[in-house]
């Protein structure tokens, strides 16, 4: 499979939102590449969200996903909001060269993403 | 129209050595990671070894079982992919094919090796 | 080396029926899987690749699906010239891209 890389680790913002790059090697001139970003929890995996774009065009995820991404040559600079603490664990960037063929899968040894819920305001007299 | 031709498959007494070829046209092959995927007599398939291709430094793998026997090779400017295989053993007996990625397969060339 | 374990080895339906065969991996393989048809006398043709996308020229009667460990190639509606055998196939590095032991699909 391809070889692809993602950092290792990655905090999120106090708001819940971690950024972090998914790049890959390509063996081919590919056209059309899926980019899908997995979470990993003991032996279960379940899709996070997924976008295919056409080299050269933006990333673009469906609207009611809390992905969003851009992409420049064989970088892919992909965003998750919405995280809250129960969301830490590790998220794979798995990218596929979809057309034209051959067909390349690529996996990534995944993000450990850290979330921390930001402490309530203490209610204030003033 | 995408063709992969293996050929130099026959008949090979145990411990010698046979060179099979497998000759690409339609496609790029210089994008392709080539494998070797064999098939004995009423049995499933066998991979058998991949080289990948220049931005992957002509990598190269190969299954448990013909591992220090068999190397794979590639010249670019012909569109050819070789498997040099060495030390054959009777187990070795299959039909060997060539593939483009996983998508381009073709027709398979026999070896048998017997005594 | 990751394990593939296909099953039936072998079935027998009609024409029309509902065809289903499981491949499943001895570790997580992210649907980084193969289905091939290998018709009688032919060589193997990719029928499935990732997991879930169609082949060019395969017909859509035939799909892929699963993620993890666990995948599953469907007929939906088995015909005539789908008489051959299938294989699976892990395709994440490291190699082996070891396949799956093969189902040989006949007619009732």
């Known amino acids: 499979a391809m070889h692809v890389a993602q950092p290792a680790v990655v905090l999120a913002s106090s708001r819940g939102i971690a950024s972090f790059v998914c790049e890959y090697a390509s063996p081919g001139k590919a056209t059309e590449v899926r980019v899908t970003v997995l979470r990993q929890a003991d032996s279960q995996v379940t899709e996070v969200c997924a976008a295919t774009y056409m080299m050269g065009n933006e990333l673009t995820f469906l609207d009611d996903s809390i992905c969003t991404g851009t992409s420049s040559g064989n970088q892919v600079n992909l965003t998750i909001q919405g995280l809250r603490a129960m969301d830490t664990g590790l998220y794979i960037c798995k990218v596929e060269l979809m057309y034209p063929p051959p067909y390349y899968l690529g996996i990534g040894n995944g993000t450990q993403i850290y979330v921390i819920d930001p402490e309530p305001c203490p209610d204030s007299d003033f | 129209e995408v063709q992969l031709v293996e050929s130099g498959g026959g008949l090979v007494q145990p411990g010698r050595s046979l060179r099979l070829s497998c000759t690409a046209s339609?496609?790029?092959?210089?994008?392709?990671?080539m494998n070797w995927v064999r098939q004995a007599p009423g049995k499933g398939l066998e991979w058998v070894g991949q080289?990948?291709?220049?931005?992957?430094?002509?990598?190269?793998y190969y299954s448990d079982s013909v591992k220090g026997r068999f190397t794979i090779s590639r010249d670019d400017s012909k569109s050819i992919a070789y498997l040099q295989m060495n030390s054959l053993k009777t187990e070795d007996t299959a039909v060997y094919y060539c593939?483009?990625?996983?998508?381009?397969w073709g027709q398979g060339t026999t070896v048998t090796v017997s005594s | 080396d990751i394990q593939m374990t296909q099953s039936p080895s072998s079935l027998s339906a009609s024409v029309g029926d509902r065809v289903t065969i499981t491949c499943g991996a001895s570790?997580?393989?992210?649907?980084?899987l193969n289905w091939y048809q290998q018709k009688p006398g032919k060589s193997p043709k990719l029928l499935i690749y990732?997991?879930?996308n169609l082949a060019d020229g395969m017909p859509s009667r035939f799909s892929g699906s699963g993620s993890g460990r666990d995948y599953t190639l469907t007929i939906s509606s088995l015909q005539p010239e789908d008489v051959a055998t299938y294989y699976c196939?892990?395709?994440?590095?490291?190699?082996?891209?070891?396949f799956g032991g093969g189902t040989k699909v006949e007619i009732k």
């Open positions: 593939t483009g990625g996983m998508d381009y």
């Open positions: 339609g496609f790029t092959f210089s994008d392709n990671w």
């Open positions: 080289i990948r291709n220049k931005p992957y430094n002509y990598e190269t």
């Open positions: 570790e997580i393989i992210y649907g980084a």
């Open positions: 990732g997991a879930t």
């Open positions: 196939q892990k395709i994440l590095s490291p190699p082996p891209w070891t």
